[in-house]
Amino acid sequence: SWMWNQFFLLEEYTGSDYQYVGKLHSDQDRGDGSLKYILSGDGAGDLFIINENTGDIQATKRLDREEKPVYILRAQAINRRTGRPVEPESEFIIKIHDINDNEPIFTKEVYTATVPEMSDVGTFVVQVTATDADDPTYGNSAKVVYSILQGQPYFSVESETGIIKTALLNMDRENREQYQVVIQAKDMGGQMGGLSGTTTVNITLTDVNDNPPRFPQSTYQFKTPESSPPGTPIGRIKASDADVGENAEIEYSITDGEGLDMFDVITDQETQEGIITVKKLLDFEKKKVYTLKVEASNPYVEPRFLYLGPFKDSATVRIVVEDVDEPPVFSKLAYILQIREDAQINTTIGSVTAQDPDAARNPVKYSVDRHTDMDRIFNIDSGNGSIFTSKLLDRETLLWHNITVIATEINNPKQSSRVPLYIKVLDVNDNAPEFAEFYETFVCEKAKADQLIQTLHAVDKDDPYSGHQFSFSLAPEAASGSNFTIQDNKDNTAGILTRKNGYNRHEMSTYLLPVVISDNDYPVQSSTGTVTVRVCACDHHGNMQSCHAEALIHPTGLSTGA
């Protein structure tokens, strides 16, 4: 059998001779040189050489355990004379013994970490790790202990884990944001003679909302012209907050003051300013100065810092309304006037009134905007605003006249304003009724008496208040001995009736009936219209067959009778 134990070899040997490893030995070896020892495997013949007679193994080079901790070799023992193996070919190992020749090395040269400001003592920040290439299973060469070289009293490090924690209460970012901590890792359990390495940890305190917004001044004053329309920005105020980001966001609001309804404040998200804007129309003549109480507050508040006081601040904003030379103001937004259509020229219709709203109360003059009254039908007294006609009117031509009146300050013609006038022309009975259409009808030769041959309709351009009431009659000159009669239906229509049985077209082929149409208004208006009646041959159904004159084309819907 082989007679050996495990071979051990100290790393980093610095002697001048080869380093002795150990001896391969067979119990068959009688010491007479009859056996030959053969070495093969890891580093055989190069790193490790064997005396083939004695079995002594030596290392020819300085070995580094951290490069290779174990070498696996094979041993043979052969009878020199016969060449027969006297021992089985066997593996054995040479284990390289560790010395403390490696310092701990941190996984990063520089660590960066963050921790919220005002954190409790003992809050985890970051864990640093150092590794030691030496043998962790043997001695303390790789037993690493962490300590803090720089960064006290703010931070501490757990000696075994490398966990860095906060060590000081109320670390305030607004006071100091950056810390550079130097951590040492030392092997040999931190004992004297141990090797060490260091790393830098750059720690940044992140912001928490521990500061309220603060106005830099207690009072602000702004001016704005009374003419500023709603939405006009009139000034900016800015509260400052020592925090950053979301924690420094500010919302502005108006909490009190006579200007509460007249002004708004909006927050500019980019600049974090409060913009005071006009909410309602201002009037210098009514109120010249407004006072507002504006509040700046953090929308996101951390409850644990509420003990520091309210996270808001107030300031007074004084707004001075500046006078603006305003145009005259009419007493009404629009005027509606009426006038009879038979009014004479220079008839006064009504009047308009405008006043300068300014304290100066400048006098005004009136004029008609001629673009709205091209025909110069109306005029205005420039001094008192009276409107009068300058031409005759006709309701039937134009019912409404829409004109614009201008009021201009005499001392400052640039200041003017306009108002619409709606003038309604009232009806006068100045038009006679007349036939709605031209009537031409026929009567059958064999017609019977009192037969309806045509219904008459009338129209009137006038528009009486109580509606039209027309009356129809034959003209006096045709009333006696007429072959036809007019029957007034009392509904603004009338019928033409036959007055005899039978007509002879050879005797009389055409009748002309003069019909008088009158209205019932004041003064009464009437007109005479003529209805042409032709005598025609008809079939037994009453349908026209032939007339002496050209064929009749009579309007649809007319009842001709049978």
Epitope: S1, W2, I72, G83, P88, E91
Partner: antibody
Framework: EVKLVESGGGLVKPGGSLKVSCAAS????????MAWVRQAPGKGPEWVAF????????YYADTVTGRFTISRENAKNTLYLEMSSLRSEDTAMYYC???????????WGAGTTVTVSS | DIQMTQSPASLSASVGETVTITCRAS??????LAWYQQKQGKSPQLLVF???LLADGVPSRFSGSGSGTQYSLKINSLQSEDVARYYC?????????FGAGTKLELK
Amino acid sequence: EVKLVESGGGLVKPGGSLKVSCAASGFTFSDHGMAWVRQAPGKGPEWVAFISNLAYSIYYADTVTGRFTISRENAKNTLYLEMSSLRSEDTAMYYCARVYVKWYFDVWGAGTTVTVSS
Amino acid sequence: DIQMTQSPASLSASVGETVTITCRASENIDSYLAWYQQKQGKSPQLLVFAATLLADGVPSRFSGSGSGTQYSLKINSLQSEDVARYYCQHYYSTPLTFGAGTKLELK
């Protein structure tokens, strides 16, 4: 007396597993490499696997790589062959053999029979 | 892989005769060759290793020779107990391979 005794053979279904053992006595077990050699009925021997004395070197035949695992317990003077995903062609007498120098077999056990059949 | 070709597959000889079995490797195996004897129902036994060296307890009528790719096993003065199958095996590199065997019978 140098002796190798195999055990654990038997009948197993295709796809099944089996672990056979070899108990060594009469020599310094930890000085020797060991091997498994099998012999199908009517055929010549076929090398299966080798393990060096300290188990740093292990080799397998291509036909069993990935399915068979050779191992040893020097403290117990025992060699093992764990077989999985067995096939009908794995049916054979399995011998445990001692290796003397670079893979020749100077001592053989009597063998254990492994039959793979459904 | 190295193939081992053994011949003859079988042979008959009389007691006292000399018998030679040959084995050819598909490539140079540098004398890393062993011969085994396997009797009916038994496990193989080592006869020769390193091509020429007899294993302990093997009768001297057995001898091995050869080099490179050609090897042979010679049995002088054949005995009745020599009836068996004979296998060659190379151990030059893995995978280790055996020859198909030679069956030796008595006439």
